[in-house]
């Protein structure tokens, strides 16, 4: 059965041609029996809100590559399942890419995008705190504090999928001042905008600011982690909470230092450095795979502080889900 699912070619990550992963290979889904109930489940699995349509997959560019296989002939969900893997399916028999299924979900807000294109918080601990930088014509610019408000911070936090904006007096780290051109001042956001770029502002690049006035923003980013499937709270398959959705962590690069950070964060003592076999006894997860290539020094207090690929970006299946066993 499919171990991963994604939408490709849409304007945002919550619409596009349906692709599923089997045995490390991404392929498409034939539109036999594909209906709004199937899309509802897919949208739920991707954290994309309600289903809004069943467009043809051929509408999305670039089209599926010729070498790419159609993997599933038909999908039949009741609409109540959490993932497509829980729905009735048939292996492909005869289907061309002209019949690829597509999906559109109602809630494509950029807060759901794992990699917002146009804004980032730089030089902070994690991607939800830091100096505001905005991309314009392929160049990153800082934002001047003049005219900045909590309403503007709300927009940035929403755009990044980082929860609520936190009121902070913190200034940018002097050693990490922006070395980029200063983009804008006089941001006047209502707080309801989808992206910072939608807020009215002064003219591009025309201001009298210096980098002492770069804007710092902090968002809540409700991050949490848990171990599931074990006999106690200190052993099991690792799941992390991101954007309100629990997902697993891929074991690429995972080792003892990463184990220690998890055990420390959970207050579970030290890692028992379990064998590969012991780690596999908790079984594979379902749903999202949130993290891949996690790298910790071992000094971190939270897994969130470790390096990792962008949230939701991975080349893993649930057979590679990390499990951790702590001393308790």
């Amino acid at each position: 059965s499919p171990s991963g699912v994604r939408l490709v070619g849409g304007l945002h990550r919550c619409e596009g041609r349906v692709e599923v992963e089997q045995k490390g290979q991404w392929g498409t889904v034939c539109d036999d029996g594909w209906d709004i109930k199937d899309v509802a489940v897919l949208c739920r699995e991707l954290g994309c809100g309600a289903a809004s349509g069943t467009p043809s997959g051929i509408l999305y560019e670039p089209p599926a590559e010729k070498e790419q296989k159609v993997l599933i002939q038909s999908v039949s969900c009741t609409g109540t399942e959490d993932t497509l893997a829980q729905c009735e399916q048939e292996e492909v028999y005869d289907c061309s890419h002209d019949e690829d299924a597509g999906a559109s979900c109602e809630n494509p807000e950029s807060s759901f995008s794992p990699v917002p294109e146009g804004v980032r918080l730089a030089d902070g601990p994690g991607h939800c705190k830091g100096r505001v930088e905005v991309k314009h014509q392929n160049q990153w610019y800082t934002v001047c504090q003049t005219g900045w408000s909590l309403r503007a911070a709300k927009v940035v936090c929403r755009q990044l999928g980082c929860g609520r904006a936190v009121l902070t007096q913190k200034r940018c780290n002097k050693h990490a001042y922006g070395r980029k051109p200063i983009w804008l001042s006089q941001m006047s956001c209502s707080g309801r905008e989808a992206t910072l770029q939608d807020c009215p502002s002064g003219p591009w690049g025309k201001n009298t600011c210096n980098h002492d006035e770069d804007t710092w923003v902090e968002c809540e980013d409700p991050f949490d982690l848990r171990l599931v499937g074990g006999d106690n709270l200190c052993s099991g398959r690792l799941e992390v909470l991101h954007k309100g959705v629990w997902g697993s962590v891929c074991d690429d690069n995972w080792g003892e230092k990463e184990d220690q950070v998890v055990c420390k964060q959970l207050g579970c003592g030290k890692s028992l450095s379990p064998s590969f076999r012991d780690r596999k006894c908790y079984g594979p997860g379902v749903g999202r795979i949130w993290l891949d290539n996690v790298r910790c020094s071992g000094e971190e207090q939270s897994l969130e502080q470790c390096q990792h690929r962008f949230w939701g970006f991975h080349d893993c299946t649930h057979q590679e889900d990390v499990a951790v066993i702590c001393s308790g």
Epitope: S1, D31, D32, G33, W34, I72, Q73, S74, S76, Q86, C87, E88, Q89, E90, E91, Y93, D94
Partner: antibody, heavy 111, light 110 residues
Amino acid sequence: QSVKESGGRLVTPGTPLTLTCTVSGFSLSINAINWVRQAPGKGLEWIGIITNIGNTYYASWAKGRFTISRTSTTVDLTMTSLTTEDTATYFCARNSYFDPWGPGTLVTISS
Amino acid sequence: ELVLTQTPSPVSAAVGGTVSISCQASQSVDSNNYCSWYQQKPGQPPKLLIHKASKLASGVPSRFKGSGSGTQFTLTINDLECDDAATYYCAGGLGDNIYAFGGGTEVEIN
């Protein structure tokens, strides 16, 4: 990719019987299996299906007397309260497009 | 409950000729399952010819053609050969995993 039925034999009315469909070359985790029967000299009659996630659906006339179950590589058809009317060749076939079919197994109900 | 009615039966035609077999559904067949056609020879299991109303199964000659939608479907066999003598069945589903077969049409080749 193939399927093959087994377990057909001569039984007396009322005797329960289980037929087995053994699959090879494909996985039941992403394929459904149908059971179909054909009385001598008659047409094809659909009995029921077990889907990749184990859900079962039956023809209205088959509900109650016929039960479909599976393991990782086999699908069983259990039949109860058999009468002479159930004498037929029983086939299994994959998915909603019914391909491939097995050679069939003959069930004869006679006193 | 879905009922599929096939006509005519039997049907006779000469080698090189054409036959058409009709399959009438009691209610509109699910728009994605459509209708399938099968060929069965004595002592053998059925063989898939056409699925989704008009798609030719792998290895089936293009002399076999399926058409139709909704409640009315047709199988046409052109350039008949002796080997086409068989019984042909249609099958359909309503998208709820409940399927049915037509009564079958015997094709005789003169």
